[in-house]
Interface confidence: medium
């Protein structure tokens, strides 16, 4: 649709406006612009014929208009009288006419405003201040800004005089801010310079910092006083009622118990003539001793021993605190605190209980921490792991096995081949192996402190021939569109290539198929019923190759939307109704029927002999697959007509 967009819509006097044409039809004869909301020859501005590229001025042409080939009209040096509607009349080559109307408004540019005030130094909670935005301007909107934000809602703020005057009643210190006024019309906005309101207030009740009132003997006492006040307050200090000094800060080095007492700060505002005071009571205490931790068992055995940690020294009427790993104590049935919190007992320690542990003594001032203590928990050995994980080797290569078992203190290792001790090392190395090196390789790990031993046995086969591989699966009955299946080709063999086949073909390219682990593992993401195929893996090296037996993937799916047959929906009275329901599903679904919502029988086939019009209604077949946990259904409407009344109806089965 032909439309006119005025850019801008609101135009400043002296500027220009473009009446921009959108969706101008193709194949035009010409177009013409008119002042006003309709085509009126007496108000034509300019016409343009495309074939001749000739523009013809009309009665309303002012010499400030320029017409462009795309029909847009530029009006320059805008005057107030240009405000209003403009109509474009377009004549297409096929003589179909279109017209569209646009409009714009003209406004004057505004001068920069300024703020006048009736009170330059108002007193808090006493005076009012009226700001006025100058000059007074016709057709302008007045706005006010406080700290460059719009005016907050407040019963103490009142706008009047067409928003030109802003009055603050009962000024407060929070009114001390930067005030600006702004004049606006649709084409310009001008802000005044800021005026800062200087509100006299205070002093408030002074605050003495720091807030703590308890000190240790020997510390420095450094008190600071502050009272909100404009102009800033003058300060005086009194100790136990005796004047000390006229400063904002009071400093007493190396205090003793004798420095305990009442400390008063007085604040004075010379402009408002007000005084305010605040008193704090300071108590100086003697220094307590630093705590330390004792243990009843420095080398506890995992899962056997308990450990009792005690915070020393014992002090009457003292609070004891504990930390583990720089955190407060976790809630655990294996952690027990004595009634006075001085002893922490760890029941049946584990290797994770090493700490560090800290205790603290809390007095009126602070908490004194002990040095950290770390428990040496004896554990292991765990079942050793032998690496690498290969079980098949080719003759002539070097066999290098490494054994590791978690243990404290570190385990001592022994290697046995077919039950015969070989060496007491963590690593076993045999160069240039042969078939005779096949056998059972045992790693034994021993913890001398706990006296415990653990072993792991690995079968090593040295053979030029690769064994027949087999496929292991992480999911024997995956569900369609839900599960993933990972097949792994066993065994893991050194210097071996792994291959896969599906239904006797090499793997298809699919984003749902992914090989990993050196092609040993084949993962099928989001399995579908079409993935229920025979999978074979193969292993090969330079001298031999072998394939696994096929593994068929049993994908559980369905039930799909069932189908009721036969498709007929109209029957004659007296016919037999024999409906069969079928739904694709693995395993086969359970079927049930409902007629007009009433449950019937749990069979795949629904048979009703000699139906009558009473058998009219909706026949629903419900299918459910217990393995996938999914259900489905379909509804069929059956109409039974009295015999002979409707030709062309099915006679039934």
């Amino acid at each position: 649709k032909l439309t006119i967009e005025s850019t801008p819509f609101n135009v400043a006097e002296g500027k220009e406006v473009l009446l921009l044409v959108h969706n101008l039809p193709q194949h035009l004869f010409g177009y013409s612009w008119y002042k006003g909301e309709r085509v009126d020859g007496n108000r034509q501005i300019i016409g343009y014929v495309i074939g001749t590229q000739q523009a013809t001025p009309g009665p309303a042409y002012s010499g400030r208009e320029i017409i462009y080939p795309n029909a847009s009209l530029l009006i320059q040096n805008i005057i107030q009288n240009d405000t209003g509607f403009y109509t474009l009349h377009v004549i297409k080559s096929d003589l179909v006419n279109e017209e569209a109307t646009g409009q714009f408004r003209v406004y004057p540019e505004l001068p920069k405003p300024s703020i006048s005030s009736n009170n330059s130094k108002p007193v808090e909670d006493k005076d009012a201040v009226a700001f006025t935005c100058e000059p007074e301007t016709q057709d302008a909107t007045y706005l006010w800004w406080v700290n460059n934000q719009s005016l907050p809602v407040s019963p103490r703020l009142q706008l009047s005089n067409g928003n030109r005057t802003l009055t603050l009643f009962n000024v407060t210190r929070n009114d001390t801010a930067s005030y600006k006024c702004e004049t606006q019309n649709p084409v310009s906005a001008r802000r005044s310079d800021s005026v800062i309101l200087n509100v006299l207030y205070g002093p408030d009740a002074p605050t003495i910092s720091p807030l703590n009132t308890s000190y240790r003997s020997g510390e420095n006492l450094n008190l600071s006083c502050h009272a909100a006040s404009n102009p800033p307050a003058q300060y005086s200090w009194f100790v136990n009622g005796t004047f000390q000094q006229s400063t904002q800060e009071l400093f007493i080095p190396n205090i003793t118990v004798n420095n305990s007492g009442s400390y008063t700060c007085q604040a004075h505002n010379s402009d408002t003539g007000l005084n305010r005071t605040t008193v704090t009571t300071i108590t100086v205490y003697a220094e307590p001793p630093k705590p330390f931790i004792t243990s009843n068992n420095s080398n506890p055995v995992e899962d056997e021993d308990a450990v009792a940690l005690t915070c020393e020294p014992e002090i009457q009427n003292t609070t004891y605190l504990w930390w583990v790993n720089n955190q407060s104590l976790p809630v655990s049935p294996r952690l027990q605190l004595s009634n006075d919190n001085r002893t922490l007992t760890l029941l049946s320690v584990t290797r994770n209980d090493v700490g560090p542990y800290e205790c603290g003594i809390q007095n009126e001032l602070s908490v004194d921490h002990s040095d950290p203590v770390i428990l040496n928990v004896l554990y292991g050995p765990d079942d050793p792991t032998i690496s690498p994980s290969y079980t098949y080797y080719r003759p002539g290569v070097n066999l290098s096995l490494s054994c590791h078992a978690a243990s404290n203190p570190p385990a001592q290792y022994s290697w046995l081949i077919d039950g015969n001790i070989q060496q007491h090392t963590q690593e076993l190395f045999i160069s240039n192996i042969t078939e005779k090196n096949s056998g059972l390789y045992t790693c034994q790990a021993n913890n001398s402190a706990s006296g415990h031993s653990r072993t792991t046995v690995k079968t090593i086969t040295v053979s030029a021939e690769l064994p027949k591989p087999s496929i292991s699966s992480n999911n024997s009955k995956p569900v369609e569109d839900k599960d993933a299946v990972a097949f792994t080709c066993e065994p893991e063999a050194q210097n071996t290539t792994y291959l896969w086949w599906v239904n006797g073909q090499s793997l298809p390219v699919s984003p749902r198929l992914q090989l990993s682990n050196g092609n040993r593992t084949l993962t099928l993401f989001n399995v579908t019923r079409n993935d229920a195929r025979a999978y074979v893996c193969g292993i090969q090296n330079s001298v031999s190759a072998n394939r696994s037996d096929p593994v068929t993937l049993d994908v559980l799916y369905g039930p799909d939307t069932p189908i009721i047959s036969p498709p007929d929906s109209s029957y004659l009275s007296g016919a037999n109704l024999n409906l069969s329901c079928h739904s694709a599903s693995n395993p086969s679904p359970q079927y049930s029927w409902r007629i007009n919502g009433i449950p019937q029988q749990h069979t795949q086939v629904l048979f009703i002999a000699k139906i009558t019009p009473n058998n009219n209604g909706t026949y629903a077949c419900f299918v459910s697959n217990l393995a996938t946990g999914r259900n489905n259904s379909i509804v069929k409407s059956i109409t039974v007509s009295a015999s002979g009344t409707s030709p062309g109806l099915s006679a039934g089965a």
Epitope: V49, G51, S93, D94, N97
Partner: antibody, heavy 121, light 106 residues
Framework: EVQLLESGGGLVQPGGSLRLSCAAS????????MGWVRQAPGKGLEWVSS????????SYADSVKGRFTISRDNSKNTLYLQMNSLRAEDTAVYYC??????????????WGQGTLVTVSS | DIQMTQSPSSLSASVGDRVTITCRAS??????LNWYQQKPGKAPKLLIY???SLQSGVPSRFSGSGSGTDFTLTISSLQPEDFATYYC????????FGQGTKLEIK
């Protein structure tokens, strides 16, 4: 002086074809839009078709669309109307007329005297 | 399509009378309306274009007005040569005529 002279009318059977011509003189034919208007016996005027100065733009009334074709030969100053699949209701006097170029081609300012087409078996 | 309806379909008047014929469009056609005069056995003649513009050579007793959907042709003082059939034509979407108004001598 602007002159428009139609020819090619006559009696034709239903389903038949006829080609009307309009010879123009007295104005710049090649820059003018042209059109055909018909008037059935005793009836009112019915606009039939129009064509742009360069033959690129053509328009037809729904009643003749697909059966009639308007064309022009600017070298011969001649306008044509090829009428196919004629029906009894196409019987009328066919007028050739000119659209002015100034200010815009939105009315018919000069008309020919017309040629009679009779469709009858 | 845009339908044009003229009223009245026929009209009897005397020389010197002021006569008004109206034309209504089925949807707005702005000012894209023309008036033609046709005498028996003759080709139509353009009187008014663009609703109110008088064609060169046409007497000033003929005038047109209207915009949008309703238009009027006025003959201020009927002359003997003015008895004819008058047609309106919309030019907003090529280019249908009204059914005509027959002006007869009373």
């Amino acid at each position: 002086e602007v002159q428009l002279l139609e020819s090619g009318g006559g009696l034709v059977q239903p389903g038949g074809s006829l080609r009307l011509s309009c010879a123009a003189s007295g104005f710049t034919f090649s820059s003018s839009y042209m059109g055909w208007v018909r008037q059935a016996p005793g009836k009112g005027l019915e606009w039939v078709s129009s064509i742009g100065s360069g033959s690129y733009s053509t328009s037809y009334a729904d009643s003749v669309k697909g059966r009639f074709t308007i064309s022009r030969d600017n070298s011969k100053n001649t306008l044509y109307l090829q009428m196919n699949s004629l029906r009894a209701e196409d019987t009328a006097v066919y007028y050739c007329a000119r659209y002015p170029s100034v200010p815009f081609p939105l009315h018919l300012d000069y008309w020919g005297q017309g040629t009679l087409v009779t469709v009858s078996s | 399509d845009i339908q044009m309806t003229q009223s009245p379909s026929s009209l009897s008047a005397s020389v010197g009378d002021r006569v008004t014929i109206t034309c209504r469009a089925s949807q707005s056609i702005s000012s894209y309306l023309n008036w033609y005069q046709q005498k028996p056995g003759k080709a139509p003649k353009l009187l008014i274009y663009a609703a109110s513009s008088l064609q060169s050579g046409v007497p000033s007793r003929f005038s047109g007005s209207g915009s949008g959907t309703d238009f009027t042709l006025t003959i201020s003082s009927l002359q003997p040569e003015d008895f004819a059939t008058y047609y309106c034509q919309q030019a907003g979407n090529p280019h249908t005529f009204g059914q005509g108004t027959k002006l007869e001598i009373k």
